[in-house]
């Protein structure tokens, strides 16, 4: 005996109470595949969430965070407050990055400046709360004997005054 339910398209469900008739999904529900015996409730976007994509009879709603907040977790399961560049979110709110660290985004944590000397390079541009240092050629490359058409300006490590 053929299962009549397999004929029910997406956006409907197989209504066993009505001799396996394909009934449309009720409001605020959907079925994304055919042959479903029930429709799923739509995802609800409320509070700190806003609707990115409305629920339809064949596809679920998708949520985003309201302005000033960003998504965390799978499928934007949580919203977290934005901070400014140069800050990180702590339990006490947005706090400026400590000296020697930076954050170039509105989310995430402050990260240490790159240590140019570890790669045998020197600091070309100092770091700030919002930006990492820019590493330049190694000090050896800047020695008088080194060939260079336009030698770069002498660089200094952050926090050090010129020699």
């Amino acid at each position: 005996l053929q299962d009549l339910c397999s004929n029910c398209p997406a956006g409907t469900f197989c209504d066993n109470n009505r001799s396996q008739i394909c009934s449309p999904c009720p409001p605020n529900s959907f079925s994304s595949a055919g042959g479903q015996r029930t429709c799923d409730i739509c995802r609800q976007c409320k509070g700190v969430f806003k609707t990115r994509k409305e629920c339809s009879s064949t596809s679920n709603a998708e949520c985003d965070c309201i302005s000033g907040y960003h998504c965390l977790g799978a499928e934007c399961s949580m919203c977290e407050q934005d901070c400014k560049q140069g800050q990180e979110l702590t339990k006490k709110g947005c706090k400026d990055c400590c000296f020697g660290t930076f954050n170039d985004q509105k989310r995430g944590i402050c990260r240490p400046w790159t240590n140019c000397s570890l790669d045998g390079k020197s600091v070309l541009v100092n770091g700030t709360k919002e930006r990492d240092v820019v590493c330049g050629p190694s000090p050896a490359d800047l020695s008088p004997g080194a060939s260079s058409a336009t030698p770069p300006a002498p660089a200094r490590e952050p926090g050090h005054s010129p020699q």
């Epitope: 969430f49 499928e75 407050q81």
Partner: antibody, heavy 116, light 107 residues
Framework: QVQLVQSGAEVKKPGASVKVSCKAS????????INWVRQATGQGLEWMGW????????GYAQKFQGRVTMTRNTSISTAYMELSSLRSEDTAVYYC?????????WGQGTLVTVSS | DIQMTQSPSSLSASVGDRVTITCRAS??????LNWYQQKPGKAPKLLIY???SLQSGVPSRFSGSGSGTDFTLTISSLQPEDFATYYC?????????FGPGTKVDIK
């Protein structure tokens, strides 16, 4: 830091109403919905409803429809939950919680005892 | 409404044990599943959100997995402070619903 501080314990007679407050601090009160959850002694957590502090919009669990009212005063960053026609089975600890998706911060709870 | 079930309802374990608690939703809730820990006389505390994301400040011995309807909370090595009741909750759609809880006590 984020804090939700609730009002103190209440003892009420059957048929009376109770109004529990939840004062928020350490974040923008109007950005996140406040939810109310209750827990009878030795029982699990029971969701009662939500309130949007920005719009005042609410949504209540079917079980409490017609008996619960959730309101707010944005000028003092405080949410309220009022439950009317109290009966002995409403004896429970009532919690407010901030909704960021999950409930990431909770009040300390308010014990409401309904007894004649 | 979406119903949440949990198993087991209680379990006895020893410090250092690996503990697994399961939670099932009556319909697909994608990843909108959260886990809470509650100790007697205290408010619940968020451990895991989005099925598998560890809440800030929660020890890494706690982990969550699953998607759709079946979810798991795992404590890799049970510590004395982990004896408590654990609840799952769906934040997919209102009415938000909790599982009945799993009490973890000392063997």
């Amino acid at each position: 830091q984020v804090q939700l501080v609730q009002s103190g314990a209440e003892v009420k007679k059957p048929g009376a109403s109770v109004k529990v407050s939840c004062k928020a601090s350490g974040y923008t009160f109007t950005s996140y919905d406040i939810n109310w959850v209750r827990q009878a002694t030795g029982q699990g957590l029971e969701w009662m409803g939500w309130m949007n502090p920005n719009s005042g919009n609410t949504g209540y669990a079917q079980k409490f429809q017609g008996r619960v009212t959730m309101t707010r005063n944005t000028s003092i960053s405080t949410a309220y939950m009022e439950l009317s026609s109290l009966r002995s089975e409403d004896t429970a600890v009532y919690y407010c919680a901030r909704e960021t998706g999950p409930f990431d911060y909770w009040g300390q709870g308010t014990l409401v005892t309904v007894s004649s | 409404d979406i119903q949440m079930t949990q198993s087991p309802s209680s379990l006895s374990a020893s410090v250092g044990d690996r503990v697994t608690i399961t939670c099932r939703a009556s319909q697909r809730i994608n990843n909108y599943l959260n886990w809470y820990q509650q100790k007697p006389g205290k408010a619940p505390k968020l451990l895991i959100y989005g099925a598998s994301s560890l809440q800030s400040g929660v020890p890494s011995r706690f982990s969550g997995s699953g998607s759709g309807t079946d979810f798991t909370l795992t404590i890799s090595s049970l510590q004395p402070e982990d004896f408590a009741t654990y609840y799952c909750q769906q934040s997919y759609s209102t009415p938000f619903t909790f599982g009945p809880g799993t009490k973890v006590d000392i063997k």
